[in-house]
Every structure is written in C-alpha cells, then in structure tokens.
C-alpha cells in the first residue's frame, strides 16, 4: 500500500481541504473510526487501484486516525494496513469527544491502560489529574492516544489551556474487575413443594464482579416470566447471587430449573440445573423392606432401622405392644430420626443390652397432615443355648440312661455323641453319633417346652443305652442360631465298681 502523503502524522489547517490517496495492487479503501467515509475509487493504466479521500472544510473533529486497507483482504498474503494520524488544531474544540464506553475503563489484571483524552493540537500541554485533585500526575502523554500507565481504581480528568482558557475533559472512571473462571452453584430452599407453596432457588457465582444471570424454568417456556433478584453477599467478597422466587407453585412448575451465568470480559460461562417437584399433597412412603420378624441377641445392643421418604417433614412415633416409646432415662432405649436428604429419613430404635422383656410387637408410625405410614414387626430375643444339666443313672431294668437338659432361643437342637476308645477319641477318632433310629443300642426321647415368661425353649432329652460293656464318654451338645454348648459324662458298665 502506498499512501500520499505518507505521514505518519499531519497537522492541517482548520477550514482547509486535504486529499489523502492510497494505492495498491488490489482495491483499497480508507477507514475512519471503523467506518468508510465517502471516497472515490480510481484505477491507473498499470492496473494499480487507488482511493481518494477528500477532506473538505476541516474542523478539529476531523482529528484522529485514518487507515488505508485492502477492500477485501481475503486471498492476499498480508492483511496490510497503513495508518495516518491527522491533527486539525481548532480552538473551538477542547478535548475530542469520547463514546460513553470509552469513559469507563475496566481492568481484569494489573496492566497498563490508556486514558484516551485527546486534543486537536499537538502543541498543547495536557495534564492528568485525579477528579478531586489539582496536582498533575506524572504520567506520560501521547497526543495521538492519551495518558498511558498503571492506574488505581479512581476517577481522572485531563486539563489543557487553549488560548487563555482552561479546558477540562470528561471524567474517566477506572475499575479493576475481579474475573476468574466461572463456578456456578444452584440450590433450592426445597426441591419438593406442595402446590400453593413457594419455590425459591438461588444461583451463586464466586470470584467475579460483573456477570449476567439467565434462568430457564418451566413457567418461562409457557411465556409466564418471573423477574429474578440479584444481590451481592456483602460478608463474602465476589459472591453474587440471583434469586428466582415463584410464589404459590402449581403442578406445572415441576421440572428443570437452569441458571446460566456469563461473564463478558473473558467470555466465560457456566450453568447448573436443579429439578423441582411440585406435588398435589404431602406424602410418606416406606423405602425398602423390613421383615415382620426381627431378632435381637440377649445382652447385646440392637438397632432397628426404618427408611422412608416424606414431605413435609413428618412426626415419628415408636410403639411397643401399643404403648408409646420414648428415650429411657436409664439409657436402655434410644430413639432417633435423621433427615439424610431433603425428603429422606432414617428412624432408628436402639435397644441397649437387650433384655428378654424387650421382646414383643413393635410399630413405627410416621405422619403429617396429608399422609401417614406405619410399619410393624415382632422382635424375638435370641438367647444362646446353655446345657443346664447332664446326668447318668442306671435304673433296675438294667439299661443305663443319660439325661441332658438345656435352654435357649430359638429352639435348640440336641446332638448326642459317644467315644468308646477313651484314649484316642475324640482327638484321633471322631465321636459316634447316637440316637439314630436304626441303631438298637440306644434309644432317644426328647421333650421341648416353651417358657412364656422367660421367652425361651427348654429341651430335655433322655438317652437310653442297652448294654454298656466298657467305659463310654457320652457328650450332649445343644445348638441354636446364636451358639452352642456341650457337656460330657463317662458312663461305666454295671459290673465295674467305679465311675468317673
């Protein structure tokens, strides 16, 4: 590109005419303040393209940058651009006017900026001041651009003297903005509401000073707009919150609520969504199964747990055999209902060092004004088996009997076994099981009794041995779901004078 005159800076007379020409190998155009002023295109015989910009009746407002560029830079190797700066000293024009946005200078980091106060005459002395101060600031001035430097968040004005009058520029405002990548969080006062109740959502963005919030929500899609409220959380710097409040929710307000946040400085954005459910009325529903028969082990602690969903929050009561339970002062029973999520609850009944008397029929009831649910189960206290008695006798009939008595809950099983070789059994040889119906050497008789008050079973078993010809170790083993117990006795033949 060839510009005539080449510049780069020209000082022209007010009211005069001045012609700028630019030529190049492709069509060229003059630009002024991002626009193309009226100009004429021409062509030479050698194929060179030119543009002529004729500036007539010049005023101070013609002061500024002029650029010549290719009309269509596509397909050209370089996006070449020639710059020319023209001054038209004009005593009627003080500082060149600025667009409104030029008066507000936003910074996102500590960097050099320019306060663009410009005059029409490059000979004028221009000074920079804080808006409320008379002292000139020591900042370098470029007549084509303005004052450049690192500025604090303040208001500034430029001053110059034209003839004998002092002229002030507009005020320039410097703002340092806190900008970071956007991180949005959305939460609701409640994600489940009954129709007629309020929906209130909050969208919070941290680390930015200037952001734009945009909500989408079911009501918006049907054209019913709700105006959000934006505020700054004063106790937390750079926390901005947008609140969307929908009074008297309807069933149609159920759905996805999305908060989209954009920050225009670095063009960052983020969005988060949350689901809101509007229900016709409140509810209580059990989650998971709880068997109708529950077990606890004697003298051990046991926690019984019921999980349910409810809205609004319910009242929870526990009953045993139709009597209301409460936390006992002795610490034998503990009741607690925890809110594990907005609408999910866990209610627990803890029995500390379980006693037999705590067996019975238990019910948990959860209710509010709209709904209720109850769950019942039988609690059985399991008692480890104990062999209470193992005795041997030889009645006149000549046979020998061994009697074993024990207790436990649930009902114990009884196993009889014997060792004939006392030296090797049971270490080397396994004991022989007794009482099988096929075996004629022994007969077995077992009786079971349930003791209501103690809530356990008693087992009494009698083993009849037909002929014992040598010493025999007889073992009685009682077994149930929570343990086993064993005792043994040595049975000797009638003929032997002793027994152990």
């Amino acid at each position: 590109l060839v510009v005539t005159p080449p510049g780069p800076e020209l000082v022209l007379n007010v009211s005069s005419t001045f012609v700028l020409t630019c030529s190049g190998s492709a069509p060229v155009v003059w630009e002024r303040m991002s626009q193309e002023p009226p100009q004429e295109m021409a062509k030479a015989q050698d194929g060179t393209f030119s543009s002529v910009l004729t500036l007539t009746n010049l005023t101070g407002l013609d002061t500024g940058e002029y650029f010549c560029t290719h009309n269509d830079s596509r397909g050209l190797e370089t996006d070449e651009r020639k710059r020319l700066y023209i001054f038209v000293p004009d005593p009627t024009v003080g500082f060149l006017p600025n667009d409104a946005e030029e008066l507000f200078i936003f910074l996102t980091e500590i960097t050099e900026i320019t306060i663009p106060c410009r005059v029409t005459d490059p000979q004028l002395v221009v000074t920079l001041h804080e808006k409320k101060g008379d002292v000139a600031l020591p900042v370098p001035y470029d007549h084509q651009r303005g004052f450049s430097g690192i500025f604090e968040d303040r208001s500034y004005i430029c001053k110059t003297t034209i003839g004998d009058r002092e002229v002030d520029s507009d005020a320039y405002y410097v703002y340092r903005l806190q900008v970071s990548s956007i991180n949005v969080s959305v939460n609701a006062v409640q994600t489940v509401v009954r129709q007629g109740e309020n929906i209130t959502l909050m969208c919070i963005v941290i680390g930015n000073e200037v952001v734009n919030f945009e909500w989408t929500y079911p009501r918006k899609e049907s054209g019913r707009l709700v105006e959000p409220v934006t505020d700054f959380l004063l106790d937390m710097p750079y926390h901005i919150r947008s609140i969307l409040h929908i009074p008297s929710a309807e069933l149609e307000d159920s759905g996805t609520y999305t908060c989209n946040v954009t920050e225009s400085v670095n063009d960052h954005q983020d969005e988060k969504a949350i689901n809101i459910t509007v229900v016709e009325s409140g509810y209580v529903r059990l989650l998971g199964e709880v068997g109708t028969l529950q077990f606890a082990e004697l003298h051990r602690s046991r926690t019984l747990q019921v999980v349910f969903e409810a809205y609004p929050p319910p009242t929870v009561l526990w009953f045993k055999d139709n009597r209301t339970l409460g936390d006992s002062s002795a610490g034998e029973i503990a009741l607690s209902t925890r809110n594990v999520s907005e609408t999910r609850y866990v209610s627990e009944l803890t029995l500390v060092r379980v006693k037999v008397a705590e067996a019975g029929h238990y019910t948990m009831r959860a209710f509010h004004e709209d709904a209720e649910v109850q769950l019942s189960f039988q609690l059985q206290i399991n008692v480890p088996v104990r062999v209470l008695e193992l005795s041997e006798s030889h009645p006149d009939s000549g046979e020998q009997t061994v009697r074993c008595r024990g207790r436990g809950m649930p009902q114990p099983n009884i196993i009889w076994s014997a060792c004939r070789d006392l030296k090797r059994c049971p270490r080397e040889l396994p004991p022989t099981l007794l009482g099988n119906s096929s075996e004629e050497e022994s007969q077995l008789e077992t009786n079971v009794t349930y003791w209501e008050e103690e809530q356990e079973f008693e087992v009494v078993s009698t083993l009849r041995l037909q002929h014992v010809d040598r010493p025999l170790s007889v073992r009685c083993t009682l077994r149930n779901a929570v343990g086993q117990d064993t005792q043994e006795v040595i049975v000797v033949p009638h003929s032997l004078p002793f027994k152990v």
């Epitope: 005539t4 005159p5 001045f18 012609v19 020409t21 015989q45 060179t48």
Partner: nanobody, 115 residues
Framework: EVQLVESGGGLVQPGGSLRLSCAAS????????MGWYRQAPGKQREVVTF???????NYVDSVTGRFTISRDNAKNTMYLQMNSLKPEDTAVYYC?????????WGQGTQVTVSS
C-alpha cells in the same frame, strides 16, 4: 499561496471534445497531488482523475478511456483532455493541487454537454 485558474470549459455536443487547462501562479516546489474534480448540480464534489508524486495517472471508472490528465512543468500547467463527452459529464470542473499540507482549488469552469 498558490493560485489556480481554470479555462477551456464551454458547451459541447455529446460525443464532442474539450480541453481544460489549470494554470498555477507562484512557484510550486513539489506537488504531492494534482487532480481534477467535478461537481454536478445537487451533488457532492468528486474526483475524476489525479496524479500523485512519482505515480501514474489514475481515473475513475466513468471516465476511463475518455479523459486524459497531463502536466507541463515548464508552464506550471495541468490539463484535462475530455473526449467522447456525454450529457452526464455536465458539471463545474475544478483543479486541485496539494503540496505538503497545503492545498489549493481553482475557481472552476463550467462544462455543459447537450445537443
């Protein structure tokens, strides 16, 4: 300051020719730009042809092949030869010379193309 005086305008039939002259009084050390402009009634003044220092003559599309710009340095005069004139060439023609940051206009000469 340089004074410019145009001459050679007049009434001419379509297809006819005219030669305009622009004489500069006073000394011109260097000419950065010299050109012919025209202003038709009710329109803006627009460039027709020009030469920049060390450059070739340039013409707008509407006069290319019909008009020729030239200069006689010895006489300090610039010329515009206009051939194949058309009614739309009717206008007041001005010469303009620019040296450094100073520019000078001629007073203008009327060219009327009519049958």
């Amino acid at each position: 300051e340089v004074q410019l005086v145009e001459s050679g305008g007049g009434l001419v039939q379509p297809g006819g020719s005219l030669r305009l002259s622009c004489a500069a009084s006073g000394s011109i050390v260097r000419v950065d730009f010299m050109g012919w402009y025209r202003q038709a009634p009710g329109k803006q003044r627009e460039v027709v042809t020009f030469i920049t220092s060390g450059g070739s003559p340039n013409y707008v599309d509407s006069v290319t092949g019909r008009f020729t710009i030239s200069r006689d340095n010895a006489k300090n005069t610039m010329y515009l030869q206009m051939n194949s004139l058309k009614p739309e060439d009717t206008a007041v023609y001005y010469c303009y010379i620019q040296s450094g940051t100073a520019g000078s206009w001629g007073q203008g000469t009327q060219v009327t193309v009519s049958s």
